[in-house]
């Protein structure tokens, strides 16, 4: 009997009520592997969740968060409010980044501006709530006697907020 069931492809189940015939998964269910005795019910993307990928007979639905929110956790298991760039989400809602910190995304926390002097560089472009500082050549490189043939160091890419 197991051999008969192993022939049932994804999208079907091995129907014990019909002599191990491979029956299609009923509506709103799926089987992602062959040889299944039952089909799994599809996930519903309702409430704060919206459908990113419809359920098919061979794969489950995938959910996303409704507009203004972003997914947290495996399989988008929770939705968290978006904030604007230059803000972070606190228990009291979205708050502007404090001076000296920035957030270039709609999620995550405000992070300190890069300290250019730690790399022996100077600030080329000041930081804002939405953007990190851009570090340029070291102050010594900008002195009158310094050669101008060497191109300045490339601007540091702002990092990504923790997900």
């Amino acid at each position: 009997l197991q051999d008969l069931c192993s022939n049932c492809p994804a999208g079907t189940f091995c129907d014990n009520n019909r002599s191990q015939i491979c029956s299609p998964c009923p509506p709103n269910s799926f089987s992602s592997a062959g040889g299944q005795r039952t089909c799994d019910i599809c996930r519903q993307c309702k409430g704060v969740f919206k459908t990113r990928k419809e359920c098919s007979s061979t794969s489950n639905a995938e959910c996303d968060c409704i507009s203004g929110y972003h997914c947290l956790g495996a399989e988008c298991s929770m939705c968290e409010q978006d904030c604007k760039q230059g803000q972070e989400l606190t228990k009291k809602g979205c708050k502007d980044c404090c001076f000296g910190t920035f957030n270039d995304q709609k999620r995550g926390i405000c992070r300190p501006w890069t300290n250019c002097s730690l790399d022996g560089k100077s600030v080329l472009v000041n930081g804002t709530k939405e953007r990190d500082v851009v570090c340029g050549p070291s102050p010594a490189d900008l002195s009158p006697g310094a050669s101008s043939a060497t191109p300045p160091a490339p601007a540091r890419e702002p990092g990504h907020s923790p997900q």
Epitope: V48, Y69, K91
Partner: antibody
Framework: QVQLQQWGAGLLKPSETLSLTCAVY????????WSWIRQPPGKGLEWIGE???????DSNPSLKGRVTFSVDTSKNQFSLKLNSVTAADTAVYYC?????????WGQGTLVTVSS | EIVMTQSPATLSVSPGERATLSCRAS??????LAWYQQKPGQAPRLLIY???TRATGIPARFSGSGSGTEFTLTISSLQSEDFAVYYC?????????FGGGTKVEIK
């Protein structure tokens, strides 16, 4: 800190209408789904239903259309009405924020239905 | 609807010991499961979502695992404040449903 504060009549007679309101303080109101959950004395939790600020709702089929939700975005409040109550509706009723799971809850209101 | 079954109904554990609570779904719910803690006279508090992700401010001694139909909440070393009732809840499908709860009591 998001806080949910709820109130409503605590003692009802059979066939009357249960009416509860929940106010949301701190944090955003619009965009979230807001739910009602109940817990009969000494028993487990039962989801009643949910509403979003736009007025869209969903409810538990077990309540057979006895339930009505409403929302007042100007006050950051949402409400529950359950008509034709019986003793089986005696429970602590909670409001909660729905973000997938229920991440913030009201303090609960005991509603007793007795003749 | 998806039926959630918790076991045992009551778990007697000594402080400092490990507690393991089980939750079973009547159908596969992937990892779309939450755990809550409820103390007498209080509202439930979210502990875990997505079967294994701790909610904000929840101590590391709480951990969740499982996928499909079998789930576990583990409290690695019980503190006095952990004696309470614990509920699992699926939000994979509507209506949203809870398990019957497991009471963790002092041995």
């Amino acid at each position: 800190q998001v806080q949910l504060q709820q109130w409503g009549a605590g003692l009802l007679k059979p066939s009357e209408t249960l009416s509860l309101t929940c106010a949301v303080y701190g944090g955003s109101f619009s965009g979230y789904y807001w739910s009602w959950i109940r817990q009969p004395p000494g028993k487990g939790l039962e989801w009643i239903g949910e509403i979003i600020h736009s007025g869209s709702t969903d409810s538990n089929p077990s309540l057979k259309g006895r339930v009505t939700f409403s929302v007042d975005t100007s006050k950051n409040q949402f409400s529950l009405k359950l008509n034709s109550v019986t003793a089986a509706d005696t429970a602590v009723y909670y409001c909660a924020r729905l973000t997938g799971p229920f991440d913030y809850w009201g303090q609960g209101t005991l509603v007793t239905v007795s003749s | 609807e998806i039926v959630m079954t918790q076991s045992p109904a009551t778990l007697s554990v000594s402080p400092g010991e490990r507690a393991t609570l089980s939750c079973r779904a009547s159908q596969s719910i992937s990892s779309i499961l939450a755990w809550y803690q409820q103390k007498p006279g209080q509202a439930p508090r979210l502990l875990i979502y997505g079967a294994s992700t701790r909610a904000t401010g929840i101590p590391a001694r709480f951990s969740g695992s499982g996928s499909g139909t079998e789930f576990t909440l583990t409290i690695s070393s019980l503190q006095s404040e952990d004696f309470a009732v614990y509920y699992c809840q699926q939000y994979y499908n509507w209506p949203l449903t809870f398990g019957g709860g497991t009471k963790v009591e002092i041995k």
